[in-house]
Interface confidence: medium
């Protein structure tokens, strides 16, 4: 068995979360991508995917998330803009694959947000907070529902019409039963 | 196997910038980070930031986030370190280095296996 | 920032002694830790990268072990080329952050 592995990433309140997922070039190019959270004792869950098939760097948004497939260099860029407290826990890239179950890319991603304030200097806040104004050409994408016994992912919105409006925006600010890492300073 | 050629030494005032690259040759470039690196004399080394060029989103470390700017070019593999407001004290030998990551992967990141040869930056008036 | 404490910051031995040098991370950095060797007028050197991994093409008198907080750079059987100083340093986390360094020389 593959043993789980995780990378930390400690970052303050309104900073970027901005990591890559790397797949096998020639078998998972055009598959569809998705990022999960992992919350102590449940199934992922699915809060972003990209379109199927996934189209070569177009960026999908949902929410404060946004996913761009580089088909050429075999990697998922993932974006969590805004960070909140509230995002702390463990998240992962899968792959999905139907009929099969999705195929997860390692390594798993622990992510730590802490207060900050206005001004606090971090890794990527002054310098980078204009990248990240959401580019006029994202679009949002469904995910499929997956029921298994290892994998259960959220069902897609009622309608495709909604997926434009406000509503349909994952919205993290929620999240309580998450496992959480001490930081110290 | 990958290569790194930096620019050549340079002498600045206090208070001016100076600009260094690093060009990549052999090898993939683009989704790789390219780290900065500093020794100052007799300190030790000091990381200053990194890029992914592909993602084109550097980070920076905290001491030097209001005065360094790194870039990176695709189309030229190379990568750009720029330091402004230039001060006695930033005298130093200035290394770009290669490493994995960072960001989920099956391979992580593998410490910064790659490096230029180092530019010697002097600041005196 | 995660700070990183190695110890000792300078070391004297002699050419065929077993030399260890450790570095504390200010919290848990999992197994994320290079060791660099660096020489006067040459750009440093990858040695040991997830901790305990040898880099290819460095000799196997070096090890590396450790993790979370506490890490060791071992040379089994030191070597003339081996004095230099040897630098830690941690991707946990952005900024990546070096140890201060522990300078090797001759006895």
């Known amino acids: 068995a593959t043993k789980l592995t995780e990378e930390k990433y400690e970052l303050k309140e309104g900073q970027t979360l901005d990591v890559k997922c790397d797949y096998t070039l020639e078998k998972f190019a055009s598959s569809q991508k998705a990022w999960q959270i992992i919350r102590d004792g449940e199934m992922p869950k699915t809060l972003a995917c990209t379109e199927r098939p996934s189209k070569n760097s177009h960026p999908v948004q949902v929410g404060r998330i946004i996913l761009e497939d580089y088909h050429d260099h075999g990697l998922l860029r993932v974006r969590m803009v805004n960070l909140q407290v509230e995002d702390s826990g463990l998240y992962q890239c899968v792959i999905y694959q139907p009929p099969k179950e999705p195929h997860m890319l390692f390594d798993r991603i622990r992510l730590v947000v802490t207060k900050g304030f206005s001004g606090t200097p971090g890794s990527n806040e002054n310098s980078t907070q204009n990248v990240y104004k959401i580019p006029p050409t994202t679009t949002k994408a469904l995910c499929p529902l997956y029921t298994s016994p290892r994998t259960v992912t959220q069902a897609p919105p009622k309608s495709t019409a909604d997926v434009s409006t406000p509503d349909s925006e994952i919205n993290l600010t929620n999240v309580t039963d998450i496992i959480r890492v001490p930081v110290f300073n | 196997q990958v290569q790194l050629v930096q620019s050549g030494a340079e002498v600045k005032r206090p208070g001016s910038s100076v600009k260094v690259s690093c060009k990549a040759s052999?090898?993939?470039?683009?989704?790789?980070?390219i780290s900065w690196v500093r020794q100052a004399p007799g300190q030790g080394l000091e990381w200053m930031g990194g890029i992914i060029p592909l993602f084109g989103t550097p980070n920076y470390a905290q001491q030097f986030q209001d005065r360094v700017t790194i870039t990176a070019d695709e189309s030229t593999r190379t990568a750009y370190m720029e330091l402004s407001s230039l001060r006695s004290e930033d005298t130093a030998v200035y290394y770009c280095?290669?490493?994995?990551?960072?960001?989920?992967?099956?391979?992580?990141?593998?410490?910064?296996?790659?490096w230029g040869q180092g530019t010697t930056v002097t600041v005196s008036s | 920032d995660i700070q990183m404490t190695q110890s000792p910051t300078s070391l004297s031995a002699s050419v065929g002694d077993r030399v260890t040098i450790t570095c504390r991370a200010s919290q848990g950095i999992s197994s994320w830790l290079a060791w660099y060797q660096h020489k006067p007028g040459k750009a440093p050197k990858l040695l040991i990268y997830?901790?305990?991994s040898l880099q290819s093409g460095v000799p196997s008198r070096f090890s590396g072990s450790g993790s979370g907080t506490d890490f060791t750079l071992t040379i089994s059987s030191l070597q003339p080329e081996d004095f230099a100083t040897y630098y830690c340093q941690q991707y946990n986390s952005y900024p990546y952050t070096f140890g201060q360094g522990t300078k090797l020389e001759i006895k």
């Open positions: 997830a901790a305990s």
């Open positions: 280095a290669r490493g994995h990551g960072p960001g989920s992967s099956h391979y992580s990141y593998y410490g910064l296996d790659v």
């Open positions: 052999g090898g993939t470039f683009s989704i790789y980070v």
